[in-house]
Every structure is written in structure tokens, then in C-alpha cells.
């Protein structure tokens, strides 16, 4: 089955789709471009804002991070919270507002687009959504704790990025989450520009690797704001 294959490291660079190409013709992406899959729930609208449920920081806007709303609260209930400004306490980079990062538990100023760190860990992941039904199938992504003694390889089912080996992050893949490669220079990345501006992509991209940040591709600067392609670029 799919899940047994996902737990192996056997399948990596698969051929392009019918009539496709490994990279996009006319766009500067590498052979495994990291162009990935659909997904979602019903989300709040910007004009009717409600707490936005999340499972990881990448599901929130750039000025937010994903956490339990109450200290020591149920880790299974997480929402997007406003990012923390300079000199505020933090536990990870994603908690700090853009232009800052977490150092020794405090948000400090960084050089522009400091590496944001992991697509952060969450204790639980909600796989279902308003439109989804498992039609009697068990949730095959429920994992025993035994599986976490070794770090997951590419394609292994995971719950959080810390379950994955170095160079991989835990990202959504249809109804489950798997370890996917962190994006390399030139690969297309996702830059969520504002609160509520994106849904939960079922096929989720990892973040850019260390020393890289997700920026507008240089040859796209002339395009309109909404049509700019983002790629992982050196700081």
C-alpha cells in the first residue's frame, strides 16, 4: 500500500507526470522543484476573523505562530497567535516577528530574513476537514511511539519535523504528513504574505534550507505583486 511505501526510502526522484517535465519549463527551479499538493478546511475570512486553528507555524501568516492559546494548555488545541516583538520571550524562531529570531529565549533583531528554523513541532495533527471522510478506513497515520526511536527518512510518515532526519521536514501530503526534503537554492517556495491569505495546502512545501530565504525570484520583479514567483535564495 501507499503507506508502506511512504515508510521506506526507496522512492525518491520520480519521473515527471504524463507529458510533464521534471522542472518547469521557463522557471528557475531545480530538477526536483518542490511544487507540491492541494488541501484544506473552511477557513475564516479576513473580515470575519476568528481564531485560526493550526498544527504548525507554516499554516499561520508571517506575523503569527502556532501554539496553544493558554500556557500549559492542551497541545491538541492550537491557534495562530500574534508574533512576539523584539525583546519578548520566545522558545523558537517562528514565535518572533519577521526581522527577528529567537536567541537565548529572547526575540532579537536579525539580518533580513534570518533562517526561520523548523516548520515547528506540534504534538498532534488534525487530518480531517469539513469536506473529508475516511469512509470507514482507519487513520493509518497513527504511529506507535516505537517508530520515533530513529529519525524518519525521506517519505516516512511523521507528525512533526523533529521526527525527521536532518535535511528533512514534516509536511502535509494528502491525508498524512511525511518527511520531505528541505528546499534547496532555486527551488520554488511558499511565502504567505498576510493573515488569512492562504489555505492549508494538502501538498505542503518544506521551508528553505539553512542560509536560504524565500524571496521573489529576481526576474519576476517586473511582474505584478500577486504574480511573483518565490524561490529559495542565499541571504
Amino acid at each position: 500500500t501507499l503507506n508502506s511505501v511512504l515508510n521506506s526510502n526507496a522512492i525518491k526522484n520520480l519521473p515527471p507526470p504524463l507529458g510533464g517535465a521534471a522542472g518547469h519549463p521557463g522557471s528557475a527551479v531545480s530538477a526536483a522543484p518542490g511544487i507540491l499538493y492541494p488541501g484544506g478546511n473552511k477557513y475564516q475570512t479576513i473580515d470575519n476573523y476568528q481564531p485560526y486553528p493550526c498544527a504548525e507555524d507554516e499554516e499561520c501568516g508571517t506575523d503569527e505562530y502556532c501554539a496553544s492559546p493558554t500556557r500549559g494548555g492542551d497541545a491538541g488545541v492550537q491557534i495562530c497567535l500574534a508574533c512576539r516583538k523584539r525583546r519578548k520571550r520566545c522558545m523558537r524562531h517562528a514565535m518572533c516577528c519577521p526581522g527577528n529570531y529567537c536567541k537565548n529565549g529572547i526575540c532579537v533583531s536579525s539580518d533580513q530574513n534570518h533562517f526561520r528554523g523548523e516548520i515547528e513541532e506540534t504534538i498532534t495533527e488534525s487530518f480531517g476537514n469539513d469536506h473529508s471522510t475516511l469512509d470507514g478506513y482507519s487513520r493509518r497515520t497513527t504511529l506507535s511511539s516505537k517508530m520515533y526511536h530513529t529519525k524518519g527518512q525521506e517519505g516516512s510518515v511523521c507528525l512533526r519535523s523533529s521526527d525527521c532526519a536532518s535535511g528533512l521536514c514534516c509536511a502535509r501530503h494528502f491525508w498524512s504528513k511525511i518527511c520531505k526534503p528541505v528546499l534547496k537554492e532555486g527551488q520554488v517556495c511558499t511565502k504567505h504574505r498576510r493573515k488569512g491569505s492562504h489555505g492549508l495546502e494538502i501538498f505542503q512545501r518544506c521551508y528553505c534550507g539553512e542560509g536560504l530565504s524565500c524571496r521573489i525570484q529576481k526576474d519576476h520583479h517586473q511582474a505584478s505583486n500577486s504574480s511573483r514567483l518565490h524561490t529559495c535564495q542565499r541571504h
Epitope: 520520480l14 526536483a32 507540491l36 492541494p38 488541501g39 469536506h131 525521506e154 495546502e201
Partner: antibody, heavy 124, light 107 residues
Framework: QVQLMQSGAEVKKPGASVKVSCKAS????????ISWVRQAPGQGLEWMGW????????NYAQKLQGRVTMTTDTSTSTAYMELRSLRSDDTAVYYC?????????????????WGQGTTVTVSS | DIQMTQSPSSLSASVGDRVTITCRAS??????LGWFQQKPGKAPKRLIY???SLQSGVPSRFSGSGSGTEFTLTISSLQPEDFATYYC?????????FGQGTKLEFK
């Protein structure tokens, strides 16, 4: 070559159910998802839902939730879409389309190959 | 849910014309968009995937561009067989959604 062959036209009465089949050939059926799309006469395309041919996981359009069931039979490489409690506004051409390479976690390009369509007429 | 707004809804053109169809997403969809051509009584046929990549076997006069929320399909020099209805489709977030369609007719 990759092909999706759908079952023939159906005429149904309001309140009845219809089950449309979509037989895949030319590729490994369980390595992809299948989407179902419908088109009412003179109207645009409407996405109905998606199913993983590997394990039957589904994702349905909210407006059809409770009336639609998508299934697969891996032994015959066939996908099925059943729609219950039919109404006159369910009269449409129903298409299946191959959608998503399940084992590919580098990219996703959506629906590529489509079936020829099945006309379902709901009339009393 | 993501709404796809396609314009124009209909378009009259002549053979040899350059034609542009636009699709706007209600929220960012990266480049998770395809363009399809449909002729009467036939199933849709994919022309463009990943917003800008040409499907194998599709003539090079068809091209796609855009990412995020604004996308365009361009036919550089219209041929008689290109008169059809064109749809965009976003597959970034469920439920997947199509544009309303653009009917391309003879002027």
C-alpha cells in the same frame, strides 16, 4: 496509453441513486488519485471530490457531503461515484479524471487525463 | 474556499489574433493552477499545468503565466481549432475550483 473509460448514460427518477464507473488502464491505478467533476447542461465545470486509489481516503465537496460516495476497486482498476437522492439539478455529464501521483512528494500537477464523460439525466 | 474568477466570460476573435484569458484566485495558490480547453460534447483537455508548463502534445502557441493570485493563458496566434471554451482550475486547496469559463468565438 493512459485511459479512463466510463460507464454509459443513465436516466433516473428524482430520489433515486446512480453509480458511475471509471475503469483505468495504461498506468498503475493505485499510484494515483481520482477526481470526479460534473458539468450541468450549458454550465461550467464543478469539482465533486477526490479519492485515493490506494486506500480509499476521500475528500468531498461540501455541498455533496452525505449524498456522494466515492470508492475504488483495485482488483479491476475501477473507480466509482455514487450519488443518492437525485434531484433534477443533478442532471449533468459526470467526468472522472486522474489526479495526483500519490508516491510523488516533489510536485503535484492536478488532473491530467479525463474520462469521456457519463450523461446522467434526472427526470420524472 | 478559494474562488476563481475568470475573465472575460466570452471573447470574439479572428484567426491569427493574439488572445489573453485571465484567472484571479481569491487567495494565494502558488502556481497550483492548470488551464483546460473544452469543445462541445467532449471532455476537457489540459493545455497548461503548474501555471506555466506546456502539456506534452499541446501546440507552443499556448502559454501560461502568473503565480499567487493572477494567472493568464495566452494564445499567440489563434487557429480555427482553438475556438472552444477555456477553464482554469486551482488544485492548491480543497475543494478544488474552476473558473467560470471563457467561450472563445469567431468574430
Amino acid at each position: 496509453q493512459v485511459q479512463l473509460m466510463q460507464s454509459g448514460a443513465e436516466v433516473k427518477k428524482p430520489g433515486a441513486s446512480v453509480k458511475v464507473s471509471c475503469k483505468a488502464s495504461g498506468y498503475t491505478f493505485t499510484s494515483y488519485g481520482i477526481s470526479w467533476v460534473r458539468q450541468a447542461p450549458g454550465q461550467g465545470l464543478e469539482w465533486m471530490g477526490w479519492i485515493s486509489a490506494d486506500n480509499g481516503h476521500t475528500n468531498y465537496a461540501q455541498k455533496l457531503q452525505g449524498r456522494v460516495t466515492m470508492t475504488t476497486d483495485t482488483s479491476t482498476s475501477t473507480a466509482y461515484m455514487e450519488l443518492r437522492s437525485l434531484r433534477s439539478d443533478d442532471t449533468a455529464v459526470y467526468y472522472c479524471a486522474r489526479d495526483g501521483e500519490l508516491l510523488n512528494y516533489y510536485y503535484y500537477y492536478g488532473m491530467d487525463v479525463w474520462g469521456q464523460g457519463t450523461t446522467v439525466t434526472v427526470s420524472s | 474556499d478559494i474562488q476563481m474568477t475568470q475573465s472575460p466570460s466570452s471573447l470574439s476573435a479572428s484567426v491569427g489574433d493574439r488572445v489573453t484569458i485571465t484567472c484571479r484566485a481569491s487567495q494565494g495558490i502558488r502556481d497550483d493552477l492548470g488551464w483546460f480547453q473544452q469543445k462541445p460534447g467532449k471532455a476537457p483537455k489540459r493545455l497548461i499545468y503548474a501555471a506555466s508548463s506546456l502539456q506534452s502534445g499541446v501546440p507552443s502557441r499556448f502559454s501560461g503565466s502568473g503565480s499567487g493570485t493572477e494567472f493568464t493563458l495566452t494564445i499567440s496566434s489563434l487557429q480555427p481549432e482553438d475556438f472552444a471554451t477555456y477553464y482554469c482550475l486551482q488544485h492548491n486547496s480543497y475543494p478544488c475550483s474552476f473558473g467560470q469559463g471563457t467561450k472563445l468565438e469567431f468574430k
